[in-house]
């Protein structure tokens, strides 16, 4: 089961003490069988297993990637998993921890001098190989932020959204990924109905900006499921 397979996301953020103020961010702590945290006059405990469901790598932390925790998968459940360190097996760049990328199925260091040539080589291999879809190249593929002193501007090549400047996200454009603007109110957005459908996008859109969500445009409710237009709308 998922519970027994996973432990990478132990204690994400702690809840507030019972009876304490809600809405205050907790602090991340490492895994333990049960964590004690102050609760009123005594200590309360929280289970250390807090799976975080996701559909895209961007929903996870920078040190995580989104995938099914078991090989067979649990009927469509994808959750954030801890990134793979150097020399660990991988299938796409997003699986490797920041400062690394996936080359020939192994996470290797994003050495500044060799990185760009190898990445281009990897893209060419992926694109020219019938067996590897664009999604094999990755959903969260952006250059490690450690490689650059400045954040990527619109149109810059990236591996992760954290490589892009504020207001931009890292999205697929043909067979590479570039920094694109986060969507504004009224702009057309993509609502992924089927798990993994984002892998088919050659021109991927960013997500909706702060305070917006991707919803069916009101005058398109009568349209057929396939032609429904989604736009970024205020909550």
């Amino acid at each position: 089961t998922l519970n027994s397979v996973l432990n990478s996301n132990a204690i994400k953020n702690l809840p507030p003490p019972l009876g304490g103020a809600a809405g205050h961010p907790g602090s991340a702590v490492s895994a333990a069988p049960g964590i004690l945290y102050p609760g009123g006059n005594k200590y309360q405990t929280i289970d250390n297993y807090q799976p975080y469901p996701c559909a895209e790598d961007e929903e996870c932390g920078t040190d995580e990637y989104c995938a099914s925790p078991t090989r067979g998968g649990d009927a469509g459940v994808q959750i954030c998993l801890a990134c793979r360190k150097r020399r660990k097996r991988c299938m796409r760049h997003a699986m490797c921890c920041p400062g690394n990328y996936c080359k020939n199925g192994i996470c290797v260091s994003s050495d500044q001098n060799h990185f760009r040539g190898e990445i281009e080589e990897t893209i060419t291999e992926s694109f020219g190989n019938d067996h590897s879809t664009l999604d094999g190249y990755s959903r969260r593929t952006t250059l490690s932020s450690k490689m650059y002193h400045t954040k990527g501007q619109e149109g810059s090549v990236c591996l992760r959204s954290s490589d892009c400047a504020s207001g931009l996200c890292c999205a697929r454009h043909f067979w590479s990924k570039i920094c694109k603007p986060v969507l504004k109110e009224g702009q057309v957005c993509t609502k992924h109905r089927r798990k993994g459908s984002h892998g088919l996008e050659i021109f991927q859109r960013c997500y909706c900006g702060e305070g917006l969500s991707c919803r069916i445009q009101k005058d398109h409710h009568q349209a057929s499921n396939s032609s429904r237009l989604h736009t970024c709308q205020r909550h």
Partner: nanobody, 125 residues
Amino acid sequence: EVQLVESGGGLVQAGGSLRLSCVVSGGTFSVYAMGWFRQAPGKLREIVAAISRTGSSIYYADSVKGRFTISRDDAKKTVYLQMNSLKSEDTAVYYCAVDGRANGERPAVAGYNYWGQGTQVTVSS
């Protein structure tokens, strides 16, 4: 001030149903994953169910699979937990939790950073 307010808890007989709601208010951030946790007296707080930002990936604890259903309404900034075929072992305080992020913000590890005060669910046999 961000607030998460749960409602829908109460006393129900075994085999009965309840629907919990949690409304997120205040703060200007995007709500990513949303989840329900529970804590029975003398036990650890445990996850019950969680739903991804787009709603396409949903996690359920083994103990509630097939009985509980989580859903979300982003327009209302609300997460729901439909609980059917309730058992006495489902008795606990139920908490909702969300991951609220400012535009473009991305933590090292994704997690639930805003929590409600909880609503009591008691299942009598």
